[in-house]
Interface confidence: low
């Protein structure tokens, strides 16, 4: 069988994964025998995942491979020293193959000390008798979230059912900040309220502004380091006033001659709301009107007395026609007919003068 090497040191640059022959770091693996079935290349059951250092807290990278006679990390093309690995090995009961797992700890200082354009990275290398397998590179980055938003939402006054766009570009950060929106301190869930939509670039759209959307809106950016709130944008949904229908025309205000009639309407259909405009135009309309003046009735002159009749009376009359009452004017007051006793003419009896007898007409 061939000789295979495994690596125990961190002092070597390693681009081909073979390392240098150095007794301090390597020892020979046992030879395989021709009768043994061929061992497969190592397969990673778990590969290291990207990690973020928050404040000064170190991160752990972890991987697991089978079959693996040895397993080590290298970071930024340099092997991590054996003493910095925590290794565990067991035999998989089903396959009978050796499973090895390993973890290392990366500190903030180690990441900060790396110079060059590339981010700090680590990868796992596992050996079996068939050769070596490399895991993917896992990048380790120092997490942060800047304090200043690149764009903050601005307050708006919008009319009912208008579309509203509130813009937000979160502060720069690693990992990239997630964005959520608050409406009066409550998280907006567009799945729950379909009138809200959050765009891929973090802007909030209110599709059709409702009165209940009058509120304070805040953009919230958060990642594993921190949570930042934008300035609050107040959205006011206003309603412009609308006129009610006109009332009926009033009666003419003049009892005689020229006057006017009026009708009114109010700005209540709807009334303006949340700073909406009051109705434009007149709330009162007037038109000229003429009412015929009333004419009070007046009497004509009395007629001449009639001749003295057989009943020893004679009479005279007058008419309410000088002028007659018109347009609701007052009727004449007083007697239409007047009679009194007489003794001349055809009268057969002499009678003393008596009081006048008044006959009233209607």
């Amino acid at each position: 069988g061939s000789h295979h090497h495994h690596h125990h040191g961190s002092d070597y640059k390693d681009d081909d994964d073979k390392g240098s022959q150095d007794d301090e770091f390597f020892h020979e693996l046992p030879e395989t025998f021709p009768s043994d079935p061929p061992e497969p290349l190592p397969h990673f059951l778990i590969e290291p995942e990207e990690a973020y250092i928050v404040k000064n807290k170190p991160v752990n990278l972890y991987c697991k491979a089978s079959p693996a006679t040895q397993i080590y990390f290298k970071c930024n093309s340099e092997w991590v020293h054996q003493k910095d690995h925590v290794v565990d090995e067991r035999v998989d009961e089903t396959s009978g193959l050796i499973v090895r797992e390993v973890s290392i700890e990366i500190s903030r200082q180690q990441v900060e000390e790396l110079f060059g354009p590339e981010d700090y990275w680590c990868q796992c290398v596992a050996w079996s008798s068939a050769g070596t397998t490399k895991s993917r590179k896992a990048y380790v980055r120092i997490a942060y979230l800047r304090k200043t938003f690149e764009q903050e939402p601005l307050g708006k006054e919008v009319s009912l059912e208008q579309e509203v766009l509130l813009q937000c570009r979160p502060p720069e950060g690693i990992p990239v900040a997630e964005v959520e929106w608050l409406k009066n301190e409550d998280i907006i869930d567009p799945a729950e309220d379909r009138n809200f939509y959050i765009t891929i670039d973090h802007n909030l759209i209110i599709k059709q502004a409702r009165l209940s959307d009058t509120a304070n809106y805040t953009c919230v950016a958060k990642n594993i380091v921190a949570k930042r709130k934008s300035t609050t944008a107040t959205v006011i949904v206003y309603v412009n006033g609308g006129w009610s229908t006109w009332t009926e025309w009033s009666v003419c205000n003049s009892r005689c001659g020229r006057g006017y009639q009026k009708r009114t309407r109010t700005c209540t259909n709807p009334a303006p709301l949340n700073g909406g405009a009051f109705c434009e135009g007149q709330s009162v309309q007037k038109i000229a009107c003429t009412t015929l003046c009333p004419v009070d009735g007046r009497w004509t002159s009395w007629s001449k007395w009639s001749t003295c009749g057989t009943e020893c009376t004679h009479w005279r009359r007058r008419e309410c026609t000088a002028p007659a009452p018109k347009n609701g004017g007052k009727d004449c007051d007083g007697l239409v007919l007047q009679s009194k006793n007489c003794t001349d003419g055809l009268c057969m009896q002499a009678a003393p003068d008596s009081d006048d007898v008044a006959l009233y007409g209607s």
Partner: antibody, heavy 119, light 107 residues
């Protein structure tokens, strides 16, 4: 003529949930904003919140964490739930109709129902 | 929240008197103010909306005026049935808020 009628228990134990229903008769529950307003004994009026038949709600921030108003247009009624009540929630609870647009005046009111919070 | 302050908190008047109640908002509310009358054991009744519009069925002796922060409810000639508590309410923004009330009593 539109009429509103509150119904629900008159006595609720502290820490429990107060539940009231307002039944609207003589008119549709659509197109208005239906509010709950309360008045502690001998005190002034406090607006609790409103709901539109579309489900849009707006609650008084001082009560928001405890209030839920819901509407059932098929039954022409709307409901109030106020959780974790204390003696300070003892009041006459009114339901009212907000005419026209959301916060316009309350032109129809229920007669009110007294809810006492006591163990 | 917009605070509504009513004054006086109570007043005594006689039938036939002219009565004026004022309401002040903590910020400008344009004309979004409503007035209600409440009698003991009864629900409030809308009198005036949008500061000066008389609600249908309310006697014309009630009138409202004002804009911005200062508002007035006037009863031109107090009638026996007008003895009650009167509340103003702003409808400019939520939460909707009421004044503390003005009790009109018989002198």
């Amino acid at each position: 003529q539109v009429q509103l009628q509150e119904s629900g228990p008159g006595l609720v134990k502290p820490s429990e949930t107060l539940s009231l229903t307002c039944t609207v008769s003589g008119g549709s529950i659509s197109s208005y904003f239906w509010s709950w307003i309360r008045q502690p004994p001998g005190k002034g009026l406090e607006w609790i919140g409103y709901i539109h038949n579309s489900g849009t709600t707006n609650y008084n921030p001082s009560l928001k964490s405890r209030v839920t108003i819901s509407v059932d247009t098929s039954k022409n009624h709307f409901s109030l739930k106020l959780s974790s009540v204390t003696a300070a929630d003892t009041a006459v609870y009114y339901c009212a109709r907000g005419r026209g647009m959301a916060t316009l005046p309350f032109d129809y009111w229920g007669q009110g129902t007294l809810v006492t919070v006591s163990s | 929240d917009i605070q509504m302050t009513q004054s006086p908190s109570s007043l005594s008047a006689s039938v036939g008197d002219r009565v004026t109640i004022t309401c002040r908002a903590s910020q400008s509310i344009s004309s979004y103010l409503n007035w209600y009358q409440q009698k003991p054991g009864k629900a409030p009744k809308l009198l005036i909306y949008a500061a000066s519009s008389l609600q249908s069925g309310v006697p014309s002796r009630f009138s409202g005026s004002g804009s911005g922060t200062d508002f007035t409810l006037t009863i031109s000639s107090l009638q026996p049935e007008d003895f009650a508590t009167y509340y103003c309410q702003q409808s400019y923004s939520t939460p909707l808020t009421f004044g503390g009330g003005t009790k009109v009593e018989i002198k």
